[in-house]
């Protein structure tokens, strides 16, 4: 009797463990990649910007995949996506084409299904930089909660990468699981 | 035999109250602070921002700390943390000593252990604010999802700290954890 | 006995499974609500926003409700807010009536007890939009934390509403539960 | 180092074009307005124009934009300009130039001398 | 268009004399805080030489006994003690805005 109630508890504590495995969520996804200073495209045209770490400094990552410079999901979810992007010109490291610029960044997904690209979120200025002024800076913000799918992809792009602040504390996009699809 | 099953139950039950207790991650940590503009520095130059409010308002804390102008972590995690700072200026209240500002912030995380500050995040611009017009305004916004150890202390420095808006609504900073360090 | 154990079991099994559920939040709510360019207000001052997708493109809603221009809390908790706001204008769509404007978000909250609203965060910027310029951008970014009780309303007030860009990507606010109310 | 060295002296007659090169070592060329001074024998310096390489945008002064081109070509880091219908006012030492890092032209071309002549 | 003047045309200075040199502007060179006047020092067959930029900063190279000073219309460019090396003749220049101007120039002669 007593044996056979232990069974039950077993399965009971069994079947507990997996629930509580699943309530964090197969450990939760996550995110935080930063610009990748090497590889900064130049120019002033819009470019998707492929170079970011992923385990230095800031960066880190835990079950999603970075790869070819796409943040690639591996758990379908409710995520939350960010970016931040940091434009900045000194006078010292040259001119500026034109004084008239659209800084803008764009968070896409892409779904490999559906060879597509779709933009979920954006942001920027026009921005007036006159050529007499030292120093220019400008940071854009972008944030939303969006569904992801196993093995769709999210990657940024922006104008005037060549205008990009290199720092890990300036210029990055991340994301975080927050719920699974019901 | 039933009291046995009963004391079973028991453990069973208590174990996972444990469990659930745990899984709610002893009721997760969250932080936001609202600037208290009593005490705002004057001048342009960057200084760190002391004083927040933490229990009136908007503003409100649980399983963080806030001492010394700093919001303390008193429990290992992955967090979102998130600033949205204001900065305005009216005629009525003066001149600006210059035209050509930076408006900026920087989230910062210090580690009692080493004692050294890093940046997490930094956002802002450079604005020409004319002379000319009555008012001027920005707002910067920057958010991102980082690792925080216990006793790690979060701060805010801005520029031009005198022209904070002193809102609740305007100029505030928070986190929260979204899940356990694997 | 083996009966009663199995009924013992049933019982631990019950209350678990609703524990897993409450674990789950009664499955968390949220929302991202996207602007319904159809209805957008013309003219330069100061509206609620009224008009949203809440279930086509990007736009979504779970366990909130979408009503007469306000996003409706069905669950006390505490939620992350944001918003995302987008302005433009380009020479084809005629003359602006001002260069000098100000482009303004306020994320407001509504209690139907207490017939009064509150601002909850607000971002923006002064602008000097030349009528040189060909095309013109501008977008603001905000995110706060905050405890929202059932019945509460969220809604968005933006100045010059008929600047608005009307991609999904662009004009949105959404908010998603993190935790319960200890 | 940066530097810029130009072609050499051109002889031409009334109403003909001439093309002068300017090629640039030392920095990255994309980055900086390049820009064309000239001088008259026995006068002062005169601003023409200038090009940013790459997008390839321009900037004329009006005495000169009817007649006067600014090209460039990245792969060879080097800067052209063309000026048509010439008469003999447009005999001069043409210089290119470039700023230093924090405004003033630093660097010139040792000059190119074009004289017009029947 | 910004017109440079400069004045004298010309002028001799005796060795360790101080020569000054004038630049005024039609409108103001002055944005942003700077002041975007630059002084240029050109030898008989020679190219240009900065010296002197954005109104009071010394060029990398250039001696210290020369200065310059002002702001939005009016210039100077000071030598504190001339030497035999200086003659030459010496330009303002502004780049406040397109098209970029030059001064008509002055001729330091050194008695």
């Known amino acids: 009797g007593s044996q056979h109630i232990r069974a039950e508890k077993a399965m009971v504590d069994g079947s507990w463990l997996d629930l509580a495995k699943r309530s964090k969520l197969e450990a939760q996804p996550f995110a935080h990649l930063t610009i990748n200073a090497t590889d900064i495209p130049s120019g002033s045209h819009k470019v998707s910007l492929s170079s970011w770490y992923h385990d230095r400094g800031w960066a880190k990552i835990s079950n999603m995949t970075f790869s070819n410079g796409k943040l690639i999901v591996n758990q379908d979810g409710f995520y939350y996506l960010y970016a931040n992007i940091c434009f900045r010109h000194h006078e010292t490291s040259g001119d500026l084409a034109t004084e008239y610029l659209q800084l803008m960044v764009y968070v896409t997904k892409t779904s490999i299904k559906i060879p597509s690209s779709h933009t979920l979120m954006k942001g920027g200025s026009t921005k007036y930089w006159s050529g007499n002024s030292e120093f220019h800076f400008y940071s854009i913000n972008v944030g939303g909660f969006f569904k992801l799918r196993s093995g769709e992809e999210i990657s940024i792009e922006v104008s005037n990468p060549s205008l990009l602040d290199p720092d890990q504390d300036a210029t990055y996009f991340g994301a975080f699981k927050v719920r699974d699809i019901d | 035999g039933s009291q046995h099953i009963r004391a079973e139950k028991a453990m069973v039950d208590g174990s996972w109250l444990d469990l659930a207790k745990r899984s709610k991650l002893e009721a997760q940590p969250f932080a936001h602070l609202t600037i208290n503009a009593t005490d705002i520095p004057s001048g342009s130059h960057k200084v760190s921002l002391s004083s927040w409010y933490h229990d009136r308002g908007w503003a409100k804390i649980s399983n963080m700390t806030f001492s010394n102008g700093k919001l303390i972590v008193n429990q290992d995690g992955f967090y979102y943390l998130y600033a949205n700072i204001c900065f305005r200026h009216h005629e009525t209240s003066g001149d600006l000593a210059t035209e050509y500002l930076q408006l900026m912030v920087y989230v910062t995380k210090t580690s009692i252990k080493i004692p050294s500050s890093h940046t997490l995040m930094k956002g802002g611009s450079t604005k020409y604010w004319s002379g000319n017009s009555e008012f001027h305004f920005y707002s910067i916004n920057v958010g991102g999802f980082f690792k925080l150890r216990s006793g790690e202390e979060i701060s805010i420095e801005v520029s031009n700290p005198s022209l904070l808006d002193p809102d609740q609504d305007a100029t505030y900073f928070g986190a929260f954890k979204v899940r356990d360090i694997d | 006995g083996s009966q009663h154990i199995r009924a013992e079991k049933a019982m631990v099994d019950g209350s678990w499974l609703d524990l897993a559920k409450r674990s789950k939040l009664e499955a968390q709510p949220f929302a991202h609500l996207t602007i319904n360019a159809t209805d957008i207000p013309s003219g330069s001052h100061k509206v609620s926003l009224s008009s949203w997708y809440h279930d086509r493109g990007w736009a979504k809603i779970s366990n909130m409700t979408f009503s007469n221009g306000k996003l409706i809390v069905n669950q006390d908790g505490f939620y992350y807010l944001y918003a995302n706001i987008c302005f433009r204008h380009h020479e084809t769509s005629g003359d602006l009536a001002t260069e000098y404007l100000q482009l303004m978000v306020y994320v407001t909250k509504t209690s139907i007890k207490i017939p009064s609203s509150h601002t909850l965060m607000k971002g923006g910027s002064t602008k000097y939009w030349s009528g040189n310029s060909e095309f013109h951008f501008y977008s603001i970014n905000v995110g706060g934390f905050f405890k929202l009780r059932s019945g509460e309303e969220i809604s968005i007030e933006v100045s010059n509403p008929s600047l608005l860009d009307p991609d999904q990507d662009a004009t949105y606010f959404g908010a998603f539960k993190v935790r319960d109310i200890d | 180092q940066v530097q810029l060295v130009q072609s050499g002296a051109e002889l031409k007659k009334p109403g003909a074009s001439v093309k002068l090169s300017c090629k640039a070592s030392g920095y990255t060329f994309t980055t900086y307005w390049l820009q064309w001074v000239r001088q008259a024998p026995g006068q002062g310096l005169e601003w023409m124009g200038a090009i940013y390489p790459g997008p390839g945008n321009t900037k004329y002064t009006q005495k000169f934009k009817d007649r006067f081109t600014i090209t460039a070509d990245t792969s060879k880091s080097t800067a052209y300009m063309q000026l048509n219908s010439l008469k003999s006012e447009d005999s001069a030492v043409y210089y290119c130039?470039?700023?230093?890092?924090?405004?003033?032209?630093?660097?010139w071309g040792q000059g190119t001398l074009v004289t017009v002549s029947a | 268009n910004i017109v440079l003047t400069q004045s004298p045309a010309s002028l001799s200075v005796s060795l360790g004399q101080r020569a000054t040199i004038s630049c005024r502007a039609s409108?103001?060179?002055?944005?942003?805080?700077?002041?975007?006047m630059h002084w240029y020092q050109q030898r008989p067959g020679q190219a240009p030489k900065l010296l002197i930029y954005l109104a009071s900063n010394l060029e990398s190279g250039v001696p210290a006994r020369f200065s310059g000073s002002g702001s939005r219309t009016d210039f100077t460019l000071t030598i504190s003690s001339v030497e035999a090396e200086d003659e030459a003749t010496y330009y303002c220049?502004?780049?406040?805005?397109?098209?970029?101007?030059f001064g008509g120039g002055t001729k330091l002669e050194i008695k």
């Open positions: 130039a470039r700023r230093g890092s924090r405004r003033g032209i630093a660097y």
């Open positions: 409108e103001s060179v002055d944005s942003y805080g700077r002041s975007f």
């Open positions: 220049q502004q780049d406040n805005e397109d098209p970029y101007t």
